[in-house]
């Protein structure tokens, strides 16, 4: 089948998903063609955990990640659901600034320098994370 | 030594329908994305079409989008283009190629030798 | 889209010469920049990756420059071999477009 049981080369895996860390950057819609090209998708953050774990391996440098509000409210890029989720924006954030003269608002989420969130222009070419669920099934056990 | 071989290209007319199919050997294509790449003298080399590694995610110049229709069987090791409803300005010669991720893209390499494709009444 | 030009169309070069083509991208591509080199009747073979990155088996006379909207393939030392056709490639976003050709002949 095509089901994935390991990461790829150049993939981290962690709590049975596969995380690939870019080293350059490209504006959110790219980044996001970029993952599903990779047959994966932009970063989810689900936990604190999680958010620690990819917080360690990107630095303080300005990331994209799954989300965006750019067809209104807040959603996450696999469907998981917003409202309910992990959230961890900075204070003030999201505030959908009109002030930086690119037109528009801010519209894509990104980890700051502090690994904190904030809404940002998703033109801007940030690096990003990808990120693709191995084998649910192959977590269990085989029937005998 | 990897190589990429084309084939189902032809003369068809206009509004009319033709498969491509490239069978890579040397290397198994379920682990990497695949494309087609189109030469005209015209318009020179335009990209066409792009599809993920499971085939759960593919990509269309708008020139071809909801006409053309890229596929895989990876399991046969090949992959496809259907190409309906063609027009004149489709007739090229269709390459398909590796789509190989590294440094944060997806670089064409290597191609196959092409196939002709020409649209005409 | 993204426009591709380069420059220029064609260039007369003899065997031994320096050449260099300019790739210019109409907006920021990063280092999302790819050049090929084609011979008559034959498919586009790879060069360059990541705008200066050499692909596997490429010869080292063959090198890559740039970042942004500016880019530049130089071959240091013209062979035989290398009266071609070059083209650049835009990776950053879709469509992934070429520029329109750069000839290689001979002088």
């Known amino acids: 089948g095509s089901e994935r049981t390991c990461c790829p080369v150049n993939w981290v895996e962690h709590e049975r998903s596969c995380y690939w860390f870019s080293r350059s950057g490209k504006a959110w819609a790219d980044a996001d063609n970029y993952c599903r090209l990779e047959d994966a998708h932009l970063v989810v953050v689900t936990s604190w955990e999680e958010q620690k774990f990819v917080q360690h391996h990107i630095g303080p440098v300005n990331t994209w990640m799954g989300l965006h509000d750019q067809n209104g409210p807040w959603k996450w890029v696999d469907g998981t659901d917003y409202e309910t989720g992990f959230k961890n924006w900075r204070p003030e954030q999201p505030d959908d600034w009109y002030g930086h003269g690119l037109g528009g608002g801010e519209d894509c989420a990104h980890f700051t320098d502090d690994g904190r969130w904030n809404d940002d222009v998703c033109q801007r070419p940030y690096r990003w994370v990808c990120e693709t669920e191995l084998d649910k099934a192959s977590q269990e056990p085989p029937l005998l | 030594e990897v190589q990429l071989l084309e084939s189902g290209g032809g003369l068809v007319q206009p509004g009319g329908s033709l498969r491509l199919s490239c069978a890579a050997s040397g290397f198994t294509i379920s682990n990497y994305a695949m494309t087609w790449v189109r030469q005209t003298p015209g318009k020179g080399l335009e990209w066409v079409s792009v599809i993920s590694a499971s085939g759960g995610n593919s990509f269309y110049a708008d020139s071809v989008k909801g006409r053309f229709t890229i596929s895989r069987d990876n399991s046969e090791n090949t992959f496809y283009l259907q190409m309906n409803s063609l027009r004149a300005e489709d007739t090229a010669v269709y390459y398909c190629?590796?789509?190989?991720?590294?440094?944060?893209?997806?670089?064409?390499?290597?191609w196959g030798q092409g196939t002709l494709v020409t649209v005409s009444s | 889209d993204i426009q591709m030009t380069q420059s220029p169309s064609s260039v007369s070069a003899s065997v031994g010469d320096r050449v260099t083509i300019t790739c210019r991208a109409s907006?920021?591509?990063?280092?999302?920049l790819a050049w090929f080199q084609q011979k008559p009747g034959k498919a586009p073979k790879l060069l360059i990756y990541a705008a200066s990155s050499l692909q596997n088996g490429v010869p080292s006379r063959f090198s890559g420059s740039g970042s942004g909207t500016d880019f530049t393939l130089t071959i240091s030392s013209l062979l035989p071999e290398d009266f071609a056709t070059y083209y650049c490639?835009?990776?950053?976003?879709?469509?992934?477009?070429f520029g329109p050709g750069t000839k290689v002949d001979i002088k």
């Open positions: 490639q835009q990776t950053n976003s879709f469509p992934f477009t």
């Open positions: 907006q920021d591509v990063n280092n999302y």
């Open positions: 190629a590796k789509a190989r991720a590294v440094a944060g893209s997806h670089w064409f390499d290597p």
